[in-house]
């Protein structure tokens, strides 16, 4: 009689993470009697798969049943396939044998691939906000995808980027892969309204990239500009005195009154406008009581944004004579104001 | 549901034989192995050996050859440990298993004069 | 044969505490091969953990395992009360099949 064979059709397997993988084998012969185990890789470090006779095998299930008289077919299916499950799996039968059972022969091995999807791009900027004409990076990861062949690309606002490097770990075979790129953003003042978008292009996707985001108003920070301006006399003896912010990002801000170098005043920015841009206008006003003011004052005003270290702008009120307006000559952006009245 | 339902306690004098019985459900007892595994009192577990009930081949532990016999009725799903010349020291608990994964309840042997 | 020997032969930790339970073959044992059982008194005992890492249905995922060779372990990284028992490692690698004499986990 001729000896048995172990065939395993195929030479490939491709299944998509998650799926079932069907890894067939047929043997040519019921002698000589023994089992059928399934094993992923060769030589010593092989991994038992199958073990149609003992050991536990949750995800794998028989074609047919092992059971039946004369019965040839081996195939097994394994559930749930994850990247981890790719490599070469061989149908080995066993001769019974004392004390342990013999490997008498085995198929020709069927090598199972796993197409797995990237996880979404999470995109992230740096750690400390910054400032127009600052560049600053931000990162694009994805992780858990099979095959290796990728494509990403970066965008600001639609408008794709050039600075960026990209790399895929690991760089020789792996059941999975990962991508990480870096991408330099200039940053400008119309930014608190803008994007950075990751775009991850694979296989498994079939055309609909996934995408991960990141608003660049978690990472950019608008100095505000200040002018100080004198209005006119509301009373015998009282000054108006504004203090407009302008053009600032974000809102986190407190502001200063110092008259010759003393503090007169502090408050915090609530009511505030917000420009077509995504920037703040803020104004502030101070009453001076000139009678109280022998000589001329200075006014300052104040401003710590964000943290930052504070910004000041001054104005000299003369107290000798009470001009019907008086103010300074600061450039001023064209943009409205939130009136906020101090006594 | 997969069940091995093991036969009740012996209590037996030290020379004799006992046989123990393991009934399964859920499943083709021809399938798979059937192991017999012991555990003195306070002690751990040891193997005895196994059966193919398709073909009736076994396999024993050297400390349990020549004393211990494992048979498998495939018409009834029913798989048996025969322990023979018995002494005080196979006082144990004695347990079937399904393929490493799946135990009975145990049956408890005293052997005592 | 293959000689399993585990250690240490009692822990004793509280609830919250990290376990680490050892193994050791007297010669390679196939990570495919080595299965870890929990047995509590009066109970059979019951699959733990299968091919050296992959937990049974329904074991936490507080259980890992891990090991190649001759050295296997088994860690609870957070002991809950219900983990007090005794665990048994186990190799059907070769004839005959061999436990280890058990390691007892208790309540410190």
């Known amino acids: 009689e001729e000896e048995l064979q172990v065939i395993q059709p195929d030479k490939s397997v491709l299944v998509a993470a998650g799926e079932t993988a069907t890894l067939r084998c047929t043997a040519t012969s019921l002698i000589p009697v023994g089992p059928i185990q399934w094993f992923r890789g060769a030589g010593p470090g092989r991994e038992l798969i199958y073990n149609q006779k003992e050991g536990h095998f949750p995800r794998v299930t028989t074609v047919s049943d092992l059971t039946k008289r004369n019965n040839m077919d081996f195939s097994i299916r394994i559930g749930n396939i994850t990247p981890a499950d790719a490599g070469t799996y061989y149908c080995v039968k066993f001769r019974k044998g004392s004390p342990d059972d013999v490997e008498f022969k085995s198929g020709a091995g069927t090598e199972l691939s796993v197409r797995a999807k990237p996880s979404a791009p999470v995109v992230s900027g740096p750690a400390a906000r910054a400032t127009p004409q600052h560049t600053v990076s931000f990162t694009c990861e994805s992780h858990g995808f099979s095959p290796r062949d990728i494509t990403l690309k970066w965008f600001k606002n639609g408008n794709e980027l050039s600075d960026f490097q990209t790399n895929v770990d690991p760089v020789g075979e792996s059941v999975s892969y990962s991508i990480h790129s870096t991408a330099k953003v200039v940053l400008t003042r119309e930014d608190v309204h803008s994007q950075v978008i990751c775009e991850v292009a694979h296989v498994t996707l079939q055309g609909d990239p996934l995408r991960g985001t990141a608003n660049l108003s978690e990472t950019i920070r608008v100095p505000p500009t200040l002018e100080v301006t004198q209005q006119p006399v509301r009373a015998e003896n009282q000054v108006n005195v504004t203090c407009q912010v302008r053009k600032f990002y974000p809102q986190r801000l407190q502001l200063t009154w110092l008259e010759n170098g003393n503090v007169s005043r502090t408050e915090t920015a609530s009511t505030v406008t917000e420009n077509k841009d995504g920037t703040y206008n803020w104004m502030s006003w101070l009453l001076v009581n000139v009678s109280a003011h022998r000589d001329d004052v200075k006014l300052t005003c104040q401003v710590e944004h964000d943290g930052q270290p504070a910004v000041s702008k001054s104005h000299d009120l003369k107290v000798s004579a009470h001009p019907k307006e008086q103010g300074s000559n600061t450039a001023a952006e064209n943009t409205g104001s939130n009136e906020r009245n101090i006594y | 549901e997969v069940q091995l339902v093991q036969s009740g306690a012996e209590v037996k004098k030290p020379g004799a034989t006992v046989k123990i019985s393991c009934k399964v459900s859920?499943?083709?007892?021809?399938?798979?192995?059937m192991h017999w595994v012991q555990q003195a009192p306070g002690k751990g577990l040891e193997w005895i050996g196994r059966?193919?009930?398709?073909?009736?081949?076994?396999k024993y532990a050297p400390k349990f050859q020549g004393r211990v016999t494992i048979t498998a009725d495939t018409s009834t799903d029913t798989a048996y440990m025969e322990l023979s010349s018995l002494r005080s020291e196979d006082t144990a608990v004695y347990y079937c298993?399904?393929?490493?994964?799946?135990w009975g309840q145990g049956t408890l042997v005293t052997v005592s004069s | 044969e293959i000689v399993l020997t585990q250690s240490p032969a009692t822990l004793s930790l509280s609830p919250g505490e990290r376990a680490t339970l050892s193994c050791s073959a007297s010669?390679?044992?196939?990570?495919?091969?080595l299965y870890w059982y929990q047995q509590k008194p009066g109970q059979a005992p019951k699959l733990w953990i299968y091919s050296t890492s992959n937990l049974a249905s329904g074991i936490p995922a507080r259980f890992s395992g891990s090991g190649s060779g001759t050295d296997y372990t088994l860690t609870i990284s957070s002991l809950e009360p219900e983990d007090f028992a005794v665990y048994y490692c186990?190799?059907?690698?070769?004839?005959?099949?061999?436990f280890g004499q058990g390691t007892k986990l208790e309540i410190k």
């Open positions: 859920g499943f083709n007892i021809k399938d798979y192995y």
């Open positions: 298993d399904r393929g490493l994964a799946y």
């Open positions: 186990h190799q059907w690698s070769s004839y005959p099949y061999t």
């Open positions: 059966i193919d009930p398709e073909d009736a081949e076994t």
């Open positions: 010669s390679s044992v196939s990570s495919s091969y």
